[in-house]
């Protein structure tokens, strides 16, 4: 169909800062240290290519990537198709976050990434430590009291947790823009549901207890017509596409080399096991440490606590896809009525999980709406 991919895009070997400057945008790179010692790279695009002269404070927009991904998700397409560049050109101060364990957040003050201890985290810790540290840093650096938060996939999950459990952090969020939101995954069609009955001991036995590599577990589900086509062989061995699903019709196939070289960006086996627990329970709750005794040590209760999104009063706008395997429309349907301050919702019938970051028509379907909503907020 597309033949073998030849790495034609220079961004294949670039880091985040290089990708930003390659397209002629200003870039600032910072290191944020979390309370538990993780060092997260944060990038800033303070203005666009044509509006550097505009003085005065620009509204701050913080973009948080999803599962198995990194900040490169927001800058992997051409500038007119990448949300980070679109926002910068629209006059906003754009910040890109990274979650612990990914390519750009794989250091810790106390633990080496070679140690099991480094990888003992799930999305709980991303919400409890990574988001507050990054948002506090941005607030201090910009001198602005509030920012706009854009999350995709797990980036929405950690937003739901952080903004419903940490009221002082929630006050810092002007609006939450949720793309392919994930709270419960009761109805997910993603291949992670194949893992839901694998006990923890076997899960660790198969995948290890550090960084998550898909191993050969998923091969048995991929021998389909879809995966036998030439171009898709490359996608079928990639954990991000395996877990999230894909639809080549909406991709700019000339950018596939960039997507594949930067993804999966890495997460912990514990995080992936947390997601399988969520599929099995159908609930939105903290990591289950495997026994009442261990749960008591972590939570002072025998069962992991539930996350209550009804406690999140941040204004939220939601976009979801009708063909999304991970953020299934039925799960989104359960989520929406629980959001006390839902200001906008749009379901895009033909969108899948990754279309929100990479689809060729994402500006028309999603990004332009975000830009206008932020500019309305300015008034």
């Amino acid at each position: 169909l597309f033949g073998k991919l030849h790495p034609g895009s220079p961004e294949v070997t670039m880091n985040i800062s290089q990708m930003i400057t390659y397209w002629g945008y200003p870039n600032e790179e910072y290191e944020v240290v979390t309370e538990d010692g993780y060092i997260l790279e944060v990038n800033r695009i303070p203005y666009g290519k044509k509006n550097s002269g505009n003085t005065g404070q620009r509204p701050v927009v913080f973009l948080q990537h999803g599962l198995l991904a990194s900040a490169t998700n927001w800058i992997s397409n051409l500038p007119n198709n990448s949300l980070a560049f679109i926002l910068a050109d629209a006059g906003y101060d754009v910040w890109l976050g990274n979650s612990r364990g990914n390519t750009w957040a794989r250091r810790n003050l106390y633990y080496s990434p070679d140690s099991v201890e480094f990888w003992a985290f799930s999305f709980d810790e991303m919400a409890k430590y990574d988001l507050p540290a990054t948002i506090d840093f941005i607030v201090k650096k910009t001198g602005q009291k509030q920012l706009h938060y854009v999350g995709h996939s797990q980036g929405t999950t950690i937003g739901f947790i952080a903004f419903s459990t940490n009221p002082s952090l929630a006050k810092r969020i002007k609006t939450f823009y949720a793309l392919a939101p994930v709270a419960t995954v009761k109805y997910t069609k993603s291949l992670i549901n194949k893992l839901r009955f694998v006990p923890q001991s076997l899960f660790k036995f198969i995948f290890g207890d550090k960084i998550f590599y898909p191993h050969n577990f998923f091969d048995q589900f991929l021998a389909t017509e879809v995966c036998s086509r030439e171009m898709l062989n490359l996608l079928c061995s990639n954990a991000l596409f395996i877990i999230c699903g894909f639809d080549s019709k909406n991709f700019n196939t000339s950018r596939l080399d960039v997507y594949l070289s930067h993804n999966p960006a890495g997460t912990s086996v514990q995080n992936m096991f947390h997601w399988t627990q969520a599929v099995k329970s159908g609930k939105f709750q903290a990591y289950d440490w495997g026994s009442p005794v261990q749960n008591r040590m972590h939570y002072d209760q025998s069962q992991p606590p539930y996350y209550n999104v009804t406690a999140m009063n941040v204004p939220i706008a939601v976009w979801n896809g009708g063909k999304d395997l991970l953020a299934d429309p039925q799960d989104v349907g359960l989520l929406l009525p629980k959001l006390p301050n839902l200001i906008y919702h749009k379901e895009i019938p033909f969108y899948n999980h990754l279309d929100f970051i990479w689809a060729m028509d994402a500006p028309q379907e999603v990004y332009n709406d975000i830009v206008s909503m932020i500019s309305e907020d300015k008034k």
């Epitope: 194949k194 009955f197 694998v198 006990p199 076997l202 191993h215 050969n216 577990f217 091969d219 048995q220």
Partner: nanobody
């Protein structure tokens, strides 16, 4: 509900071999993972060999190169070939299967390796 039943355990001398079988009441072809666990005296049950539906295998370091996991989908049976047995291999061996409907355990079979 798939029922699993192990057989082939027993008493064997160090250096000897055993072949454990795990017969399933239903199809094992639909199992995503078939695995063998060992519970050594006074210890927790832990996985020692796993076989994915794709055919790929994983072994615990302690058995690597000595044990081989396999399955015969037509006979709905999984096997564990154990060679060069040592007293440390003594314990109850359980077979398990994980599929779309759940995770299933056998009752276990005792293996004792004497020195």
């Amino acid at each position: 509900q798939v029922q699993l039943q192990e057989s082939g355990g027993g008493l064997v001398q160090a250096g000897g071999s055993l072949r454990l079988s795990c017969a399933a009441s239903g199809s094992i072809g639909s199992m995503y993972v078939m695995s063998w666990y060992r519970q050594a005296p006074g210890k927790e049950r832990e996985p020692i060999a796993a076989l994915m539906g794709s055919g790929s295998t994983t072994y615990a370091d302690s058995v690597k190169g000595r044990f081989t996991i396999s399955r015969d989908n037509e006979k709905n049976t999984m096997y564990l070939q154990m060679n060069s047995l040592t007293p440390e291999d003594t314990g109850v061996y359980y077979c398990a299967g994980t599929g779309a409907e759940g995770h299933y355990w056998g009752q276990g079979t005792q293996v004792t390796v004497s020195s």
